[in-house]
Amino acid sequence: QEEDLPRPSISAEPGTVIPLGSHVTFVCRGPVGVQTFRLERDSRSTYNDTEDVSQASPSESEARFRIDSVREGNAGLYRCIYYKPPKWSEQSDYLELLVKESSGGPDSPDTEPGSSAGPTQRPSDNSHNEHAPASQGLKAEHLY
């Protein structure tokens, strides 16, 4: 009998409000034994996959997706899913990335890990979570 896969989580380092030109890393977490993590942007048609997985804790594995130089076009909603053979998980909640002018100011403080503001998340649409693994030829418009 197939196990029920827990939903992944998503976070961003150093936060979800990023100055233009700075870097951001999305961190996706799932259970032990994940083969592929996928970071989706806004809709399923735009995504990046990785099989470069870390052992995050005794019960979790994780993957990182780095954007070296954030542009305005990188702002938007992101979520994670993962493939643990033989099936894909449900999606994580959405995380919203905001891009600000590098000048900054008191009106737009960075959201740091552990800050009270926390990431902006929206419930994901889990109406259908059948995803073809990338190896089966689903076309990806890459995120970055």
Partner: antibody, heavy 120, light 107 residues
């Protein structure tokens, strides 16, 4: 079909150098961490080195036995993995395998290996 | 470094036997345990990951179990094509380490 083809092995004198190459095909190379694993004649398996992807800043890791002598590197544009081996010792004599890992460290796909002999 | 110990370096077995190969880690590896089969003259083949997950194409007579420091590879009914050396490997922490191997031979 996943293919990993190692080249560059051969006979080298102690304290000499050698550069191994691994040509990868049949999968998306740049999303995978890659490893070198070796096996001395008639002996068991020994993990040698690992390199991660751009998402992880191409981080590299080494076995203590090769640290400061071996350097793992990759060229994602050519789907190539390399192992530069300097100051070679007789105990480095082994078959060297290029390996694609899965699940964060399980060695899922192995090349056929290239033989390195260190002898005077 | 985590040491991986396979207590038996070789087993003499009969076809059809149930075979159990054990692997002990020097500390908890939280199920980050892989098993490999290496037939004479061939490259290693991944059989099992995460202690219990059978890789695609591996016959169902193979199974893995265990947790913490102690892990087991089982073959329910040994076939002639199973004659090989079997290695365990931990991937909880770098440096990744392999057991010394257990060679199965036919009586």
């Amino acid at each position: 079909e996943v293919q990993l083809v190692e080249t560059g092995g051969g006979l080298v004198q102690p304290k000499g150098s050698l550069k191994l190459s691994c040509a990868a095909s049949g999968f998306t190379f740049n999303i995978n961490a890659m490893n070198w694993v070796r096996q001395a004649p008639g002996k068991g398996l020994e993990w040698v080195a690992r390199i991660r992807t751009k998402n992880n800043n191409y981080a590299t890791y080494y076995a203590d036995s090769v640290k400061d002598r071996f350097t793992i590197s990759r060229d994602d544009s050519e789907s190539m993995l390399y192992l530069q081996m300097n100051n070679l010792k007789t105990e480095d004599t082994a078959m060297y395998y290029c390996v694609r890992d899965r699940y964060g460290g399980a060695m899922a796909y192995w090349g056929q290996g290239t033989s390195v002999t260190v002898s005077s | 470094d985590i040491q991986m110990t396979q207590s038996s370096s070789s087993f003499s077995v009969s076809l059809g036997d149930r075979v159990t190969i054990t692997c002990k880690a020097s500390e908890d590896i939280y199920n980050r345990l892989a098993w490999y089969q290496q037939k004479p003259g061939n490259v290693p083949r991944l059989l099992i990951s995460s202690a219990t997950s059978l890789e695609t194409g591996v016959p169902s007579r193979f199974s893995g179990s265990g947790s913490g420091k102690d892990y087991t590879l089982s073959l329910t009914s040994l076939q002639s094509e199973d004659v090989a050396t079997y290695y365990c490997q931990q991937y909880w922490t770098i440096p990744y380490t392999f057991g010394g191997g257990t060679k199965l031979e036919i009586k």
